[in-house]
Amino acid sequence: MSRSNRQKEYKCGDLVFAKMKGYPHWPARIDEMPEAAVKSTANKYQVFFFGTHETAFLGPKDLFPYEESKEKFGKPNKRKGFSEGLWEIENNPTVKASGYQSSQKKSCVEEPEPEPEAAEGDGDKKGNAEGSSDEEGKLVIDEPAKEKNEKGALKRRAGDLLEDSPKRPKEAENPEGEEKEAATLEVERPLPMEVEKNSTPSEPGSGRGPPQEEEEEEDEEEEATKEDAEAPGIRDHESL
């Protein structure tokens, strides 16, 4: 964006789009101010990602004011949690992880409310929140879809998030980040499939076919690799 963005200072509660390598600009909120005393996060803001309810530390160059940027970045995207995030930033901007509601704070001096899913410490570590890997503190970055036609199939919407015929076993996600009992580990999870627009909902495999992806978003998604250390910790619907 413009250079002026790099100089922008944010305060607690500010709504932004946050950019992490390999991911689209993500709706987020400034949760903590930079503290020069903490070397690892000096000049970085702790941001809370809407939709995934995860946190990361980002510098101002990767943050973009929400109101000014929503026309540019606020378009539906196939990444898991993105549309939920767009909805939350508009309708529930004070949401906290696990349903904790925060009040907008003027400064970050006060103790934050408990956030079981957000780990303290380095920016590349997070608690085992929705979308993060099973190994606590580490992030899994999803690989870009291998085929063009796979990409289109991944954007789905409410009412078409499950398939009639499960394709492969996968551990069910738990939005509360709780440990699962052994009995529930091998839950059949559907794999989204390509579908025609306007297919009859009752037909097997009918899903919400995606609107055309924009080239800009396609390119960004290609950047995502296993080596990306920082990301909102979200997965494509493929991982359903």
């Epitope: 939920e84 909805w87 409410a158 998030l161 398939e163 069910a172 939005p175 306007n198 359903l240």
Partner: antibody, heavy 120, light 106 residues
Framework: QITLKQSGPGIVQPSQPVRLTCTFS??????????VAWIRQPSGKGLEWLAT???????RYNPSLKSRLAVSKDTSNNQAFLNIITVETADTAIYYC????????????WGQGTLVTVSS | DIQMTQTTSSLSASLGDRVTISCRAS??????LNWYQQKPDGTVKLLIY???RLHSGVPSRFSGSGSGTDYSLTISNLEPDDIATYYC????????FGGGTKLEIK
Amino acid sequence: QITLKQSGPGIVQPSQPVRLTCTFSGFSLSTSGIGVAWIRQPSGKGLEWLATIWWDDDNRYNPSLKSRLAVSKDTSNNQAFLNIITVETADTAIYYCAQIYDYAVGFAYWGQGTLVTVSS
Amino acid sequence: DIQMTQTTSSLSASLGDRVTISCRASQDISNYLNWYQQKPDGTVKLLIYYTSRLHSGVPSRFSGSGSGTDYSLTISNLEPDDIATYYCQQYGKLWTFGGGTKLEIK
């Protein structure tokens, strides 16, 4: 502030068509990701989802009612419509419309409901 | 079609009680579950979305949990204003509601 208000004919005769209108404010059905859902509730019974109209007209219907329902919209006047092609006495119910966002966020805001009575 | 079952159609509780309302899906719905409150006057409100997330303006005494096919809504400190019928709803494959649980004060 998001508000939705349903309106309809009140009483209608069996086998006649019915058109219900949902007039809303605070959002637009031309905005990517926005939809309006129609839900009904027969007296003393539970909620039943009927249909959803999305911003891009890729709509969804309850399979058991699909042949009798059609949804449409007038984005410039902030209205969504539910057409029941031929009503039956079993269609007597309170009809609600609700705003829905693209992915996982539920029927976020509801209208107050309008009663449709099918009677000869 | 995915069926949603709320086995308890009505329950009575005292003010201040902790109340849990359960809901079961006919198949794994991957946490794609919402809870709604319908007041006696017919007003319907979204309480919880995506199993456990509190909708804007909903008091924190409401919480949701569950996974796979079994889900629950908990009201931690029952207040007079909570007298209503509560519905679960899946949105993984189209949308279906549970039959509702009517909550009354003892």
